[in-house]
Interface confidence: low
């Protein structure tokens, strides 16, 4: 089976306050079984932004139907961006278990927030 790669093609994304930000993430293999989660930041202080298995996450929607078994696109859209949303976002694959364990991370996408146009 193919080795899993997590592809975050954007090094950075710049969005005006109040707009939506699309953060791209695709995976190259359905194995191992387990959910995708998005975090802002790394290490113990990281913030959960989206979990495929939990919710709701009111400002976060998935770009494609992540419930489909064969789906490999885990890109998300975050609405109504504010300066507090700035940071580096990581798309992370977890291996199913009790509890789920982190398996592999994407390279990260830095989100910067521009002032709302006057």
């Amino acid at each position: 089976e193919e080795e899993l790669q997590i592809i975050q093609p954007d090094k950075s994304v710049s969005v005006a306050a109040g707009e939506s930000a699309i953060l791209h993430c695709t995976i190259t293999s359905l194995f191992p079984v387990g959910p995708i989660q998005w975090f802002r930041g790394a290490g113990p202080a990281r913030v959960l932004i989206y979990n495929q298995r939990q919710g709701p996450f009111p400002r976060v929607t998935t770009v494609s139907e992540t419930t489909k078994r064969e789906n490999m696109d885990f890109s998300i859209s975050i609405s109504n961006i504010t300066p507090a949303d700035a940071g580096t976002y990581y798309c992370i694959k977890f291996r199913k278990g009790s509890p789920d364990t982190e398996f592999k991370s994407g390279a990260g996408t830095e989100l910067s927030v521009r002032a709302k146009p006057s």
């Epitope: 592809i7 093609p9 954007d10 090094k11 950075s12 791209h24 695709t26």
Partner: antibody, heavy 119, light 108 residues
Framework: DVQLVESGGGVVRPGESLRLSCAAS????????MNWVRQAPGEGLEWVSL????????YYADSVKGRFTISRDNSKNTLYLQMNSLRAEDTAIYYC????????????WGLGTLVTVSS | ETVLTQSPGTLSLSPGERATLSCRAS??????LAWYQQKPGQPPRLLIH???NRAAGIPDRFSGSGSGTEFTLTISSLQSEDFAVYYC??????????FGGGTKVEIK
């Protein structure tokens, strides 16, 4: 102005080694991911290797994995490619290419240095 | 690995004519596609990124279009300096970054 100047090419025999250098100027080198791309005579472009700005992350094409090593010295604004166990099929012009800071295309290229592997 | 297929391999046209170059990806690369121009003895030069955005200093006779798997580079009216080899490159699926095989635009 951004400048990338490769050096270190030459003629070697199969199995020998060579180290290429790329001197960079005109941009913040330590913040830029850098690549080597090669072009065999009369052929198309082939990506060879990538190194992140910090030097912590490296990737290689399957065709060179285990034989080539990419590195950088940010204090000298210089990119390197150590090429070991050279083969005839490694004969090419080797270009140093800077990745765009937002996306992963190449916004600047050096003039290239020719590596010829021949017995 | 995403494979890029360029067509035609060679395009023979006269100055002033319109050139249409095609690049097809083996899987979707969204709009993460760049076009480069290469003249003999020179390194490639960035023309277009994000499928349709012209790089700085590139004349507006060059335009890019497409998304997903089908992309086109159009040169609206060929100038003598436009006769060269053109490569597409995807930067969605990486590594490896991949290039198309190139299209040579030659004088008819």
């Amino acid at each position: 102005d951004v400048q990338l100047v490769e050096s270190g090419g030459g003629v070697v025999r199969p199995g020998e080694s060579l180290r290429l250098s790329c001197a960079a100027s005109g941009f913040t080198f330590s913040s830029s991911d850098m690549n080597w791309v090669r072009q065999a005579p009369g052929e198309g472009l082939e990506w060879v290797s990538l190194i992140s700005g910090s030097g912590e992350i490296t990737y290689y094409a399957d065709s060179v994995k285990g034989r080539f090593t990419i590195s950088r010295d940010n204090s000298k604004n210089t990119l390197y490619l150590q090429m070991n166990s050279l083969r005839a099929e490694d004969t090419a012009i080797y270009y140093c290419a800077k990745e765009n800071n937002m996306y992963r295309f190449f916004d600047y290229w050096g003039l290239g240095t020719l590596v010829t592997v021949s017995s | 690995e995403t494979v890029l297929t360029q067509s035609p391999g060679t395009l023979s046209l006269s100055p002033g004519e319109r050139a249409t170059l095609s690049c097809r990806a083996s899987q979707s690369v969204y709009t993460y596609l760049a076009w480069y121009q290469q003249k003999p003895g020179q390194p490639p030069r960035l023309l277009i990124h994000a499928a349709r955005n012209r790089a700085a200093g590139i004349p507006d006779r060059f335009s890019g279009s497409g998304s997903g798997t089908e992309f086109t580079l159009t040169i609206s009216s060929l100038q003598s300096e436009d006769f060269a080899v053109y490569y597409c490159q995807q930067y969605y699926d990486r590594p490896p970054l991949t290039f198309g095989g190139g299209t040579k635009v030659e004088i008819k």
